[in-house]
C-alpha cells in the first residue's frame, strides 16, 4: 500500500556539509543530510539512519517521502510544516521509526498529502487530533485517502489507562476529517472489538483491514453505511460465527469481497444460517477453505460441506441436574 | 488520478477471437474492480462483466456469458477481456472502467467485426 | 434483469437553464443509481453516484436525487461545456444495467 520510488539516480548529501548549511536559510532543492533524493522521482528517502527528528530542509518537489526505520519518538505540531509548504506531497511512510507519541495538528500544511503509514509504530499516545489538526467539532477535510495503522499498538506496559480501540477510534473520527477516507488498513492491533461508530462516519471507505486481530464478534458492526465497501479483510481474528443481521448487510454490499480465513468457526446450531448463506453467496473469497474448529468433534470440517443435521447446540440442562 | 490505457482498434472476421487490454496506471487509488462495457455505433452503454483483480473473481452478463472471458494480471496492472466467436453485431466501442461505481473509464477500443 | 427507462431521449436548453433527467428502475434499486457523462467522441465521465455523491472533482452544478426506483439528475445552471449524453445505470443487483441515455443540447 505505501509508496515505492521508481527512481533509479538517487543523490545522496554529504554528511560533512550538515552542520554548515543549517546554519543559514535552506536552499529550495538540497537534499537532506542522511537522505537520498531523486528531483526526478520527485522522491526522497531517509530510511534507517536512526533520524530523531523530521529534517527541516526537505526539498520542496518532494512527492513520496520515507522516513522508514528511524527513532523519530516524537512527531510534534507541525512537523511537515514548511514555508514554503510542501505542497506537493503526497505519500509519507514513517513505518517503523519508533513513533510512540503522534501530537495534534502533526499533519498539518500537508495539503496534498494522500496516503499515510505508521505501522509498525508502538503508539502508546495517538492524539485524536492528529490527522484532523484541530479541536473542532468538523475540521477542514483532509486530503488523506489512504491510512495505513497495521501493527501501531504498544506493549501492554506503555499502553496508556484507556482503551487502545477508543484512542485509535477518536483519532479517525475526530473533526469528521477522514470523510474521504478510502483505505483504512488496521491489521495486527490486538482490537478484541471495532466501536459501532466508527464505520458509520467513514463513509468513503473502500478498503478496511481488519485481519490479525482479537475479534470475537461482529454483532454491534454495521456495515451498511459503507456502500461501496469493496474489501473486508477478517482474516485471522477470533469470529465465532456471524449472525443473520451481518450476513444480510454484507450481502447487500454490491461490490464487496469479504475474507474470513482462519477464524475459529464454532459449528454448532449458532452456525446454521452462516453455513447457508456461505453456500449461496459470492462474496466471501476462499470459502471453500473455511473450517470448524470447535467443537472438538466438528474440528477440520469444512464449512460448506456441512448440512442442518451437523450443527447440533448441547441441550442446557436444567440447574438441578448440572453438575460441578 | 486513476488513468486506464487501452490497447489498439481491432478489425476481425466473424468467428474470430479478440483480445483487448487495459493498463491501469495512477495504481495507488485504483479500484479492485475492474469493469468491461460495450457501446455499438449510435447505441447506449451495456455491462459486459467484472473482475476483482486481487482474487481472479468474475461476475459476467449472461447476454455475453460462455463468449467472453475478463482476466487480469497484477503484477502488470493489467486486465483484459477476451470476446469469441465473433459475430458483426459486436461491432463496436469496448471500454475498461475502473472502480465500483466505475469511477473512471479509459478512452475506448474500437473493434469491427466484418468478412 | 433490472430495467433502467431514462427520459427524455433527447432535450435542448438554453445556457443558464435548470435541467433535470429521469430514471426509472424496473425495482427498487436501494439507492445504487449511478449517472455518467460522455461528450461526443470522448470517453465517459462518471458524475454522481450512489444517488447523490458528487465524485471527485465534479461541479457542483451536477446533482442528483431520488429513491426506491425513480431518481432525478438535475444541472442547475447549464454551461456549454455540459453539451453531452448523460447515463443513468444501476448497480444494485447483477448484471448493471444503463438507461438509454439522454442527448442534451443547446438552444
Known amino acids: 500500500s505505501s509508496p515505492t520510488s521508481s527512481a533509479s539516480s538517487f543523490s545522496s548529501s554529504a554528511p560533512f556539509l550538515a552542520s554548515a548549511v543549517s546554519a543559514q536559510p535552506p536552499l529550495p532543492d538540497q537534499c537532506p543530510a542522511l537522505c537520498e533524493c531523486s528531483e526526478a522521482a520527485r522522491t526522497v528517502k531517509c530510511v534507517n539512519r536512526n533520524l530523531t527528528e523530521v529534517p527541516t530542509d526537505l526539498p520542496a518537489y518532494v512527492r513520496n517521502l520515507f522516513l522508514t526505520g528511524n527513532q523519530l519518538a516524537v512527531l510534534p505540531a507541525g512537523a511537515f510544516a514548511r514555508r514554503p509548504p510542501l505542497a506537493e506531497l503526497a505519500a509519507l511512510n514513517l513505518s517503523g521509526s519508533r513513533l510512540d507519541e503522534v501530537r495534534a495538528g502533526a499533519f498539518e500544511h500537508l495539503p496534498s498529502l494522500r496516503q499515510l503509514d505508521l505501522s509498525h509504530n508502538p503508539l502508546a499516545d495517538l492524539s485524536p487530533f492528529a490527522f484532523s489538526g484541530s479541536n473542532a467539532s468538523v475540521s477542514a477535510p483532509s486530503p488523506l485517502v489512504e491510512l495505513i495503522l497495521n501493527h501501531i499498538v504498544p506493549p501492554e506496559d506503555e499502553r496508556q489507562n484507556r482503551s487502545f480501540e477508543g484512542m485509535v477510534v477518536a483519532a479517525l473520527l475526530a473533526g469528521r476529517a477522514l470523510q474521504g477516507l478510502r483505505r483504512l488498513e488496521l491489521a495486527s492491533n490486538h482490537f478484541l472489538y471495532l466501536p459501532r461508530d466508527v464505520l458509520a462516519q467513514l463513509p468513503s471507505l473502500r478498503h478496511l483491514d481488519l485481519s490479525n486481530n482479537s475479534l470475537v464478534s461482529l454483532t454491534y458492526v454495521s456495515f451498511r453505511n459503507l456502500t461501496h465497501l469493496e474489501s473486508l479483510h477478517l482474516e485471522d481474528n477470533a469470529l465465532k460465527v456471524l449472525h443473520n443481521g451481518t450476513l444480510a448487510e454484507l450481502q447487500g454490499l454490491p461490490h464487496i469481497r469479504v475474507f474470513l480465513d482462519n477464524n475459529p468457526w464454532v459449528c454448532d446450531c449458532h452456525m446454521a444460517d452462516m453455513v447457508t448463506w456461505l453456500k449461496e453467496t459470492e462474496v466471501v473469497q476462499g470459502k471453500d477453505r473455511l473450517t470448524c474448529a470447535y467443537p472438538e468433534k466438528m474440528r477440520n470440517r469444512v464449512l460448506l460441506e456441512l448440512n442442518s443435521a451437523d450443527l447440533d447446540c448441547d441441550p442446557i440442562l436444567p440447574p438441578s441436574l448440572q453438575t460441578s | 488520478e486513476v488513468q486506464l490505457v487501452q490497447s489498439g482498434a481491432e478489425v476481425k472476421k466473424p468467428g474470430a477471437t479478440v483480445k483487448i487490454s487495459c493498463k491501469v496506471s495512477?495504481?495507488?487509488?485504483?479500484?479492485?474492480?475492474m469493469n468491461w462495457v460495450q457501446q455499438a455505433p449510435g447505441k447506449g452503454l451495456e455491462w459486459i462483466g467484472r473482475i476483482y483483480r486481487e482474487d481472479g473473481h468474475t461476475n459476467y452478463n449472461g447476454k455475453f456469458k460462455g463468449r467472453v472471458t475478463i482476466t487480469a494480471d497484477t503484477s502488470t496492472d493489467t486486465a483484459y477481456m477476451e470476446l469469441s466467436s465473433l459475430r458483426s453485431e459486436d461491432t463496436a466501442v469496448y471500454f475498461c472502467?475502473?472502480?465500483?461505481?466505475?469511477?473512471?473509464w479509459g478512452q475506448g477500443t474500437l473493434v469491427t467485426v466484418s468478412s | 434483469d433490472i430495467q433502467m427507462t431514462q427520459s427524455p431521449s433527447s432535450l435542448s436548453a438554453s445556457v443558464g437553464d435548470r435541467v433535470t433527467i429521469s430514471c426509472r428502475a424496473s425495482q427498487d434499486i436501494s439507492n445504487y443509481l449511478n449517472w455518467y457523462q460522455q461528450k461526443p467522441g470522448k470517453t465517459v465521465k462518471l458524475l454522481i453516484y450512489?444517488?447523490?455523491r458528487l465524485h471527485s472533482g465534479v461541479p457542483s452544478r451536477f446533482s442528483g436525487s431520488g429513491s426506491g426506483t425513480d431518481y432525478t439528475f438535475t444541472i442547475s445552471s447549464l454551461q456549454p461545456e455540459d453539451i453531452a449524453t448523460y447515463f443513468c445505470?444501476?448497480?444494485?443487483?447483477?448484471?448493471?444495467?444503463f438507461g438509454g441515455g439522454t442527448k442534451l443540447e443547446i438552444k
Open positions: 495512477g495504481y495507488a487509488f485504483s479500484s479492485s474492480w
Open positions: 450512489y444517488t447523490s
Open positions: 445505470q444501476q448497480d444494485n443487483t447483477l448484471p448493471w444495467t
Open positions: 472502467a475502473n472502480g465500483g461505481a466505475m469511477d473512471y
